[in-house]
Interface confidence: low
């Protein structure tokens, strides 16, 4: 099939980085500066993406692949292919229409992006709070209150007692 196609369509011989110029006898012409074609047999070259303003160039455009952008420090990418840059906030904050705001009590955000999320409710799993949550960190759940009651059996066996004066081998 490929062989048949290339015999019928001269453009299939044009590699990535070129375009097949139908106006000029289907000749393979190189993509002009600041354009690319990522596959063979293309009739046109696409204009390279330009990473301007809050965007910065992560990967230069080449004749066969588009430029890739990321965001300048203080911003992070959103959307497919980093189509938008959104302002960073500090840990313990979330971005609102009015800018970065501290997480409300009972919520946290351990990243510079995203929203504040509720602390884990340890009691739902029958556990107790071992370490309290903060604006930046979730709570740490510990053993259930029953596990801490006197006489309760432990799942892990106790470590063997050592004789005084003997260091472990």
């Amino acid at each position: 099939f490929e062989r048949t196609r290339s015999l019928q369509d001269p453009c299939s011989n044009c590699p990535a980085g070129t375009f097949c110029d139908n106006n000029r006898n289907q000749i393979c012409s190189p993509c002009p500066p600041n354009s690319f074609s990522s596959a063979g047999g293309q009739r046109t070259c696409d204009i390279c993406r330009q990473c301007k303003g809050v965007f910065r160039t992560r990967k230069e455009c080449s004749s066969t692949s588009n430029a890739e952008c990321d965001c300048t420090p203080g911003f992070h990418c959103l959307g497919a292919g980093c189509s938008m840059c959104e302002q960073d906030c500090k840990q313990g904050q979330e971005l609102t229409k009015k800018g970065c705001k501290d997480c409300c009590f009972g919520t946290f955000n351990d990243q510079k992006r995203g929203i504040c999320r509720p602390w884990t409710n340890c009691s739902l799993d029958g556990k107790s709070v071992l370490v309290n949550g903060t604006k930046e960190r979730d709570v740490v759940c510990g053993p259930s209150p029953a596990d801490l009651s006197p006489g309760a059996s432990s799942v892990t066996p106790p470590a063997p007692a050592r004789e005084p004066g003997h260091s472990p081998q």
Epitope: A16, G17, P33, T64
Partner: nanobody, 126 residues
Framework: EVQLLESGGGEVQPGGSLRLSCAAS????????MAWFRQAPGKEREFVSR?????????YVAESVKGRFTISRDNAKNTLYLQMSSLRAEDTAVYYC???????????????????WGQGTLVTVK
């Protein structure tokens, strides 16, 4: 004034290696595709390899040099290179670097696609 100056040619034994350089001046080197051609005595100028304006992937290499010759460029130094290895007697020729036109109606393997040429450097394999 646009100038291209090749260097690095010389005599080498079969199986040997050479690295040709092409120093460009007088224009924005990084904005143009570049190519190497060669011309053996009594023969037409032959396409060797071409590299896109920004050093992207090499989209054309002559079958006769595939796997032996590598084209590269350093836009900061305004220089084009041709690393030649496993040289054969039939590689003997004058090697030219050339600047690609911004737009051409010709195939990129044809000399008409290129508007400026160096004076050439002779490579002899024997």
């Amino acid at each position: 004034e646009v100038q291209l100056l090749e260097s690095g040619g010389g005599e080498v034994q079969p199986g040997g290696s050479l690295r040709l350089s092409c120093a460009a001046s007088g224009w924005a080197f990084g904005n143009y595709g570049m190519a190497w051609f060669r011309q053996a005595p009594g023969k037409e100028r032959e396409f060797v390899s071409r590299l896109a304006w920004n050093g992207g992937s090499t989209d054309y290499v002559a079958e006769s040099v595939k796997g032996r010759f590598t084209i590269s460029r350093d836009n900061a130094k305004n220089t084009l290179y041709l690393q030649m290895s496993s040289l054969r007697a039939e590689d003997t020729a004058v090697y030219y670097c050339a600047r690609q036109r911004s737009y051409s109606r010709y195939d990129i393997r044809t000399p008409q696609t290129y508007d400026y040429w160096g004076q050439g450097t002779l490579v002899t394999v024997k």
